[in-house]
């Protein structure tokens, strides 16, 4: 008789990434009998929750349930009903909530409490909502990309199954850019990590990894822009801020109260003789770059080498995957190609920022102006952060790979987080077993 396949024995997991600008829900799937194998977990769905990040619900906690409904209902549809009760759900909140907690622990707790109550109403196995540390965010991002790239697999292959694979076991570094923070994580070459706060030790699949990581709070692209505006308005002679990071002809009124709402601008706060000011774009990449560099304090370093603000950074080593907003921004600007040199990227950013606002609006007519207006700043910020902040050079630029997905799964911290919490990355290499025939009768 013909072999007939039994229903597949699979498991699912859900992770919600509650970022500063938005929340995304990810559904992962893997074969139950291969839990400890490397590279078997893959993403089957991403659902972007409509609206801002959860920290914005501080005055509207009663709406958090409605906010999460569509994506949680989507998870209900995607995951077979028979699997609902055993599907774990995790929510990790990142820098937006770290900032809210800095302002008010009570408000942050209230938001998380309502999130937990909302998620508990679903038929899944809810495992909790928490604010993850910057160190965790960096570490799990690093685990995610290396897991997906097959770097933890001990089997050497003569063929490449994933992009960017150099067919060796050297791990990729991880560069993550969010709205409120940015993380850099990699294995330095035989270098002691001089600051204990930045050191992580992992044993994964029988191999030890000494990993460097740091999360720069307030240096995500949105908070960096608020910082830059707060810094620049200090020296403005009146309520007009001629800003090189916005296109020529662009105009926008900003409330000073909005500028000082975030803890990230506290260091620049001063009493101004006006309640509002107008940004007037002048679109000059070089001047924008210079203005951004003033956000990085490089004047003091208590270690052999620093990134900025006195934070230790070992010499860069190997290839890096740059994801999240690093990818989204560069993708929008059409600058993700491996063939584009750093000089070319800079050249294209100069041209882009210099384009008149009216022209930009016509070229990208479908995009809301609120978001469209910030790509000149964001692109320039990415270059400044990578080159001056992290010390990439024109030569090492080619080691940066702007990555959205690997093998169909989004690059980001969520997969690594789930792999860790479900104990799916063993410390030791699993014993290899003969191929199972259990799925056939």
């Amino acid at each position: 008789t013909q072999n007939k396949a039994l229903p597949e024995n699979v498991k699912y997991g859900i992770v919600l990434d509650a970022g500063s600008s938005h929340t995304s829900l990810y559904i992962y799937k893997w074969p139950a009998e291969k839990e400890n194998d490397t590279g078997v977990v893959h993403q089957v769905e991403e659902c972007r929750v409509k609206g801002p990040g959860i920290s914005k619900f501080v005055q509207k906690v009663n709406e958090i349930g409605i906010y999460l409904t569509d994506c949680m209902e989507r998870a209900r549809e995607v995951i077979p009903r028979s699997q609902h009760q055993e599907t774990p759900v995790y929510l990790g909140a990142t820098a937006g909530m770290r900032l809210l907690r800095m302002e008010s622990e009570e408000l942050a707790d209230r938001v998380l409490d309502v999130v937990e109550r909302s998620l508990s109403n679903y038929p899944f196995d809810f495992q909790g909502a928490r604010i993850i540390t910057g160190q965790e965010e960096g570490a799990y991002g690093w685990i995610t990309i290396n897991y997906l790239l097959g770097k933890f697999s001990q089997k050497t292959r003569w063929f490449s199954i994933v992009p960017y694979e150099t067919n060796n076991q050297e791990t990729f570094g991880a560069l993550d850019l969010g709205g409120a923070s940015t993380q850099v994580t990699f294995v330095p070459q035989n270098q002691t990590i001089e600051s204990p706060d930045n050191a992580l030790q992992f044993r994964l699949y029988g191999k030890d990894y000494n990993v460097y990581t740091h999360s720069f709070l307030c240096y995500g692209k949105d908070q960096a822009l608020w910082q830059k505006l707060a810094k620049d308005i200090q020296v403005a002679s009146n309520e007009i801020l001629r800003d090189p990071c916005f296109h020529p002809g662009y105009k926008k009124v900003v409330n000073v109260s909005d500028l000082y709402k975030t803890p990230c601008t506290k260091r620049f706060e001063m009493t101004l003789p006006f309640q509002q000011f107008e940004i007037q774009g002048i679109g000059n990449y070089q001047q924008c770059h210079q203005s951004i560099l003033e956000l990085f304090n490089t004047s003091y370093c208590p270690y052999s080498q620093c990134a900025f603000n006195g934070i230790f950074l070992p010499p860069l080593q190997g290839d890096f995957g740059a994801f999240s907003a690093f990818y989204f921004v560069m993708k929008f600007l059409n600058l993700t190609s491996e063939k584009v040199s750093q000089e070319k990227v800079t050249e294209m950013m100069k041209k882009f920022c210099a384009q008149p606002w009216e022209e930009i609006k016509t070229s990208y007519a479908g995009v809301k102006e609120k978001y469209l207006s910030e790509y000149c700043f964001s692109g320039t910020y990415i270059l400044s952060l990578l080159l001056q902040g992290y010390h990439f050079t024109a030569d090492s630029w080619e080691h940066i790979h702007f990555i959205g997905k690997i093998q169909g799964s989004d690059a980001g911290w969520t997969l690594g987080y789930m792999l860790n919490l479900t104990n799916m990355i063993p410390a030791e290499q699993p014993l290899s077993t003969p191929l199972s025939h259990s799925t056939y009768v």
Epitope: G51, Y67, N255, A365, K370
Partner: antibody
């Protein structure tokens, strides 16, 4: 269900100001942009402006700059439009309308839910 | 500003037959991304407007498939097959390619 409730009528004196309200219910207020549209008696529709309730970001039709000010009160899920220095030209029905922009938050969308409209009559 | 032009009245239609309403824009609404930023709204007597069609060819949720739209970048036609009594009202075309968003003057659909 999703609703935008507006008061039925406002009678105001020439030269005065009026603040129109639009109370949202049945959805996450800060997750959708709110637009305001003017309709003069027997005439077409005129777009006034839009506001993102999550952070008060606004865009205005130049024809209404200085005339209309859009704000929100997140705690009560209410959008407001203040109209000042009113003249007979401002007599109209004013609608608030929610924007649906699909899965791509950064894209422009369409007005999928409209308020009941407030009739403003400017008369001494 | 982009000007949207409509004829004020359509020819009165008989129930169950087809109706066409036209709209013209002063600038092409077809963007290089392939999307046409043209919308249709219906305002029934005594009611608020409601969306029918977005981005020229997409039917809004709950709108019967008797409604369809075709057109080039500047000339558009809304077609209603098997017209029903509840279809009467003013039909507005609109664009959101550029700020300010603009509407046509509206076309009144009435029954014979």
């Amino acid at each position: 269900q999703v609703q935008l409730q507006q008061p039925g009528t406002e009678l105001v004196m020439p030269g005065a100001s009026v603040t129109l309200s639009c109370k949202a219910s049945g959805y996450s207020f800060i997750s959708y942009w709110m637009h305001w549209v003017k309709q003069r008696p027997g005439q077409g529709l005129e777009w006034i402006g839009e506001i993102d309730p999550s952070d008060d970001y606004t865009n205005y039709n130049q024809n209404f700059k200085g005339k209309a000010t859009l704000t929100v009160d997140r705690s009560s899920s209410t959008a407001y439009m203040q109209l000042n220095s009113l003249t007979s030209e401002d007599s109209a029905v004013y609608y608030c309308a929610r924007e649906e922009n699909g899965i791509y938050y950064y894209n422009k969308g369409y007005l999928d839910v409209w308020g009941t409209g407030t009739t403003v009559t400017v008369s001494s | 500003d982009i000007v949207m032009t409509q004829t004020a009245f359509s020819n009165p239609v008989t129930l169950g037959t087809s109706a066409s309403i036209s709209c013209r824009s002063s600038k092409s609404l077809l963007h290089s991304n392939g999307i046409t930023y043209l919308y249709w709204y219906l305002q029934k007597p005594g009611q608020s407007p409601q969306v029918l069609i977005y981005q020229m060819s997409n039917l809004a949720s709950g709108v019967p498939d008797r409604f369809s739209c075709s057109g080039s970048g500047t000339d558009f036609t809304l077609r209603i097959t098997r017209v029903e009594a509840e279809d009467v009202g003013f039909y507005y075309c609109a664009q959101n390619l550029e700020l300010p968003y603009t509407f046509g003057g509206g076309t009144k659909l009435e029954m014979k």
